[in-house]
């Protein structure tokens, strides 16, 4: 039974330009974490495997690093890097956990105080 | 002036599928995501889903995944909502709303969907 | 999904009352940034619904300085100064900080 769950960073509103922390967190469950994939949108960004370690997808190898431990840092963001984010925990045994994160990558004409951004 | 304008009530037999269109007049239509909410028995609002005018992205809420698909038309400013395999458990009111930092500025009037045989 | 709760599920009310909506979530709406993506919503008979509140105490712009959102974490509260007949309706809460959204159940502002 699985019976983990997985907290994320929430939602987050940024800047066009800045850069935001991506983070998910698998608690409640005592299954060893063999991947974690992050994806967006059917686009796979990035994996960290426990044996082999971190490895980005070439398309976004400039303006992603991996980390803090198991999070994701983009950078230079994009109004087109909007979008739901996707953390996919493999576990053994539990299965897979999922989370979800929207980001929202405003123009600076459209955004305002309280969308969060900090430069690179 | 920001203006959401969806369109009419319909009437469908169950089974069928139907398109809700909102067509969004007075800002940037890629600026903003838009999203669209169900209203059942005049009361419980739910999160249908939103998508990104800009990229095409969507987002959805698991209940409704398979049921429907959120699509964009940037040339005509125009977002449309597609419900699939119709039951009585859809009829209810349908509303756009454009989002902004997670929260809903403006809103459609409303697309009344009554499903019934 | 994160629930929703409001309180009371009516108000009844008269004019020039002072009220207060209640809504608390069950985690809390406070993003790693220390964002809160909390709102409300005025659902009027007829109409579609209005934003009221943003970022937990932000007024919408056009919004009367009669209400007022206050709160933090998972305790967030509405509350209007002098009740009007404008603003009889259903009120909502909503979540915007975990997927999916959720609102609350609604609170309905109604005349004694």
């Known amino acids: 039974m699985m019976t983990g769950t997985i907290e994320t960073t929430g939602n987050i509103s940024a800047e066009k330009g800045g850069s935001i922390i991506l983070q998910c967190h698998l608690s409640s469950t005592t299954a060893q974490v063999t991947q974690v994939n992050w994806e967006q949108q059917d686009q796979l960004l990035a994996i960290c495997n426990a044996d082999l370690g971190w490895h980005i997808s070439p398309s976004f190898k400039d303006r992603v690093a991996p980390g803090p431990g198991l999070g994701l840092t983009l950078q230079s963001l994009t109004v087109n890097d909007t979008g739901e984010y996707f953390c996919i925990y493999h576990t053994y045994p539990d299965g897979t956990y999922t989370g979800r994160i929207f980001l929202e990558v405003l123009e600076s004409s459209v955004a305002e105080h309280g969308a969060r951004f900090q430069i690179p | 002036e920001v203006q959401l304008q969806q369109s009419g009530p319909e009437l469908v037999k169950p089974g069928t599928s139907m398109k809700i269109s909102c067509k969004a007049s007075?800002?940037?239509?890629?600026?903003?995501?838009m999203n669209w909410v169900k209203q059942s028995h005049g009361k419980n609002l739910e999160w249908i889903g939103l998508?990104?005018?800009?990229?095409?992205?969507?987002s959805y809420n698991q209940k409704f995944k398979g049921k429907a698909t959120l699509t964009v038309d940037k040339s005509s400013s125009t977002a449309y909502m597609e419900l699939l395999s119709l039951t009585s458990e859809d009829s209810a009111v349908y509303y756009c709303?454009?989002?902004?930092?997670?929260?809903?500025?403006?809103w459609g009037q409303g697309t009344t969907l009554t499903v019934s045989s | 999904d994160v629930v929703m709760t409001q309180s009371p599920l009516s108000l009844p009310v008269s004019f020039g009352d002072q009220v207060s909506i209640s809504c608390r979530s069950s985690?809390?709406?406070?993003?790693?940034?220390?964002?809160?993506?909390l709102s409300w919503y005025l659902h009027k008979p007829g109409q579609s619904p209005q934003l009221l509140i943003y970022?937990?105490?932000n007024r919408f712009s056009g919004v009367p300085d009669r209400f007022s959102g206050s709160g933090s974490g998972t305790d967030f509260t509405l509350k209007i100064s002098t009740i009007k007949p404008e603003d009889l309706g259903m009120y909502y809460c909503?979540?915007?900080?975990?997927?999916?959204?959720?609102f609350g159940g609604g609170t309905k502002l109604e005349i004694k």
């Open positions: 709303a454009r989002g902004l930092s997670f929260r809903y500025d403006y």
């Open positions: 007075g800002y940037s239509f890629t600026g903003y995501t």
């Open positions: 998508i990104v005018p800009y990229n095409g992205g969507t």
């Open positions: 985690q809390s709406l406070a993003n790693s940034y220390g964002d809160t993506f």
């Open positions: 970022g937990i105490s």
């Open positions: 909503l979540q915007g900080t975990h997927q999916p959204p959720t």
